[in-house]
């Protein structure tokens, strides 16, 4: 027990107060007259003596008091035991009730908390997603700014060194001009001398020309005889040719045709017997306009027209719409063949597209689309792809369905932002999408965590910039 007090109330009853936790119990007990000794009755109204009692009487009295005290003590002990027993029962009941009530309350509070937590988590997830998106955007913009700053710094340094070089050249040229003036005077004198000598020569040549003219007259006569002989021969040859074509056309109709010298694509070049890798001149369909392309005559059976190549970062791919339309770069190295040619070509017949990729760890992979074509410029050279196979990811890294082509000066993507300006290079950006093979070229050990690099997400992830890429097309029926 925490607290136990005994006191007397106004009418002489004994009062016991028990404190347990927040509960306090008060017991009012009557006086125990039956416990008093019969030999010495207690007189409640007896007057207190002035003089002390006799010794015997005192002893007796003390014994009676001791008995009463002993009885009281025993009775109190019984009472305490009784209280303790009752308290235990009551406490168990109280605790059970409390636990039941508190459990219900706690469950209710817990449910509310869970609901609130879930709601907060959802809101946090939304905010986190927005923050991530904005962070990514800001990172991209920062990257763009830092890149352009670096470019500007480099340009300023280059220009400063060029100015210094030009100043050195200027002073050098001034000296040269002075020296040349001196030489010029000497040369003028020698030219005058040469002129005199030439006049002598001219008069000699005139006499020789007269002699030659006489010989020409003789030759002309002989020439007319030769011409007649040549005419006769030509007639004979023509007759022979006519006879040959008549007899051969019955056997083989292709002989009469003129040999094909213009090719639409590398498949036609291959079929004509040219089976060596290299640069060939191709002709636009239904046109005389020509374009130079690299033909891969070895990979996968040959006949592949290379429409894009990245390998060393030697060519800048952050180009305008017009440049991507007509093509740029060097067909033997890094280049873009041209959207207009590819669009016209792939709308004539069915083509397959193969994309060959290399990473910086010596691995290679490819994606093959069994049907590929580009819409016309009217529809911003929108890409159309079907039937993906290959080792560079089971999902297409060129977003499906196809997107319009975008460049730094032609924002045709599905982002509120300008993907081409942020990620660099012309590409079929979505918003902004999982690939960009025309991004910034990053060298080894600088090629990770790059948002604007050469990306093929479903092979190497978003931040990995590839070492080399080749895009090639070939007729599906090759």
């Amino acid at each position: 027990y925490n607290n136990f007090r005994k006191s007397m109330d106004s009418i002489g009853k004994k009062q016991y107060q028990v404190q347990h936790g927040s509960c306090s119990y008060t017991f009012l007990l009557p006086e125990m007259d039956n416990c008093r000794s019969s030999s010495s009755p207690y007189v409640s109204n007896a007057v207190q003596r002035d003089a002390p009692l006799e010794y015997d009487d005192s002893v007796q009295r003390l014994q009676v008091l001791e008995n009463i005290m002993e009885n009281n003590t025993q009775w109190l002990m019984k009472l305490e035991n009784y209280i303790q027993d009752n308290m235990k029962k009551e406490m168990v009941e109280i605790q059970q009730n409390a636990v039941q009530n508190q459990t219900a309350v706690m469950i209710e509070i817990g449910t509310n908390l869970l609901n609130q937590t879930a709601e907060q988590t959802r809101k946090l997830t939304d905010v986190e997603a927005q923050v991530l998106n904005q962070t990514t955007r800001l990172e991209l913009q920062l990257l763009e700014h830092s890149l352009s700053t670096n470019k500007l710094e480099k340009q300023i340094l280059d220009q400063t060194s060029e100015i210094n070089k030009l100043q050195d050249k200027n002073s050098f040229l001034e000296k040269k001009v002075l020296a040349m003036e001196d030489k010029h005077i000497i040369q003028l004198q020698s030219i005058k001398e040469e002129k005199d000598q030439l006049q002598v020569l001219v008069s000699k040549q005139n006499s020789i020309i007269e002699e030659l003219e006489k010989k020409i007259v003789t030759a002309t006569v002989n020439n007319s005889v030769l011409q007649k002989q040549q005419h006769d021969l030509m007639e004979t040859v023509n007759n022979l040719l006519t006879m040959m074509s008549t007899s051969n056309s019955a056997k083989d109709p292709t002989v009469a045709k003129e040999e094909q010298i213009s090719f639409r694509d590398c498949a036609e070049v291959f079929k004509s017997g040219h089976t060596t890798n290299g640069i060939y001149t191709l002709t636009f369909p239904n046109s005389t306009e020509e374009i130079k392309a690299y033909c891969d005559m070895e990979a996968g059976g040959g006949g592949w027209t290379i429409i894009q190549r990245r390998e060393d970062g030697s060519v800048d791919f952050q180009r305008t719409w017009k440049e991507y339309k007509v093509g740029f770069g060097n067909p033997s190295g890094e280049y873009w063949l041209g959207n207009e040619f590819v669009s016209q070509l792939t709308n004539q017949q069915r083509y397959v597209l193969k994309i060959h990729l290399k990473d910086w760890e010596g691995n290679e992979a490819y994606s093959l689309y069994e049907h590929f074509y580009l819409s016309s410029e009217e529809l911003n050279y929108r890409i159309h792809l079907k039937g993906l196979t290959g080792t560079a990811g089971k999902i297409s890294s060129i977003s499906q369905p196809g997107n319009d082509f975008s460049t730094k000066d032609g924002d045709n993507d599905k982002c509120i932002c300008k993907c081409s300006q942020m990620l660099t290079g012309g590409w079929w950006f979505d918003a902004c999408g999982p690939s960009n093979l025309n991004g910034m070229y990053y060298p080894q050990r600088q090629n990770t965590n790059k948002f604007n690099g050469i990306k093929w997400y479903y092979w190497k992830g978003s931040g990995y910039s590839l070492k080399a890429t080749t895009m090639m097309i070939r007729p599906a029926d090759f």
Epitope: S375, E377, E378, L379, N380, P401, D404, G410, N412, K414
Partner: nanobody, 120 residues
Framework: EVQLVESGGGLVQPGESLRLSCVAS????????????MYWYRQAPGKERELVAI????????TYADSVKGRFTISRDNAKNTMFLQMNSLKPEDTAVYVC?????????WGQGTQVTVSS
């Protein structure tokens, strides 16, 4: 050249809704409205033109500016050569001239625009 005509603008109170329409015509021979990706822009007085929403040619993919996300919905009816912009929970800061746009051969064709004013 393609002609784009917007309608549906007007004066509304904050929290109210409007539905803008953009009818397109005059596409080159061999091409139809359903071939083109379409855009809604807006320009508030003294501010730069802002791209509000994009819809793909098939109408399946849509993109919105952060400022209108969850309130505006872009859609199209290719059979009627029409694009829509459903604007809910309008705010005073949505006040602007709303213009529809199409990009062909990397060139822009614009409508005249329709005025939307949100004021109490």
């Amino acid at each position: 050249e393609v002609q784009l005509v917007e309608s549906g603008g007007g004066l509304v109170q904050p929290g109210e809704s409007l539905r803008l329409s953009c009818v397109a015509s005059g596409f080159p021979s061999g091409f139809t409205f359903s071939d083109y990706q379409m855009y809604w822009y807006r320009q508030a007085p003294g501010k730069e033109r802002e791209l509000v929403a994009i819809i793909s040619n098939d109408g399946l993919r849509k993109t919105y500016a952060d400022s209108v996300k969850g309130r505006f919905t872009i859609s199209r009816d290719n059979a009627k050569n029409t694009m829509f912009l459903q604007m809910n929970s309008l705010k005073p800061e949505d006040t602007a001239v709303y213009v529809c746009n199409v990009r062909r051969a990397n060139r822009d064709d614009w409508g005249q625009g329709t005025q939307v004013t949100v004021s109490s």
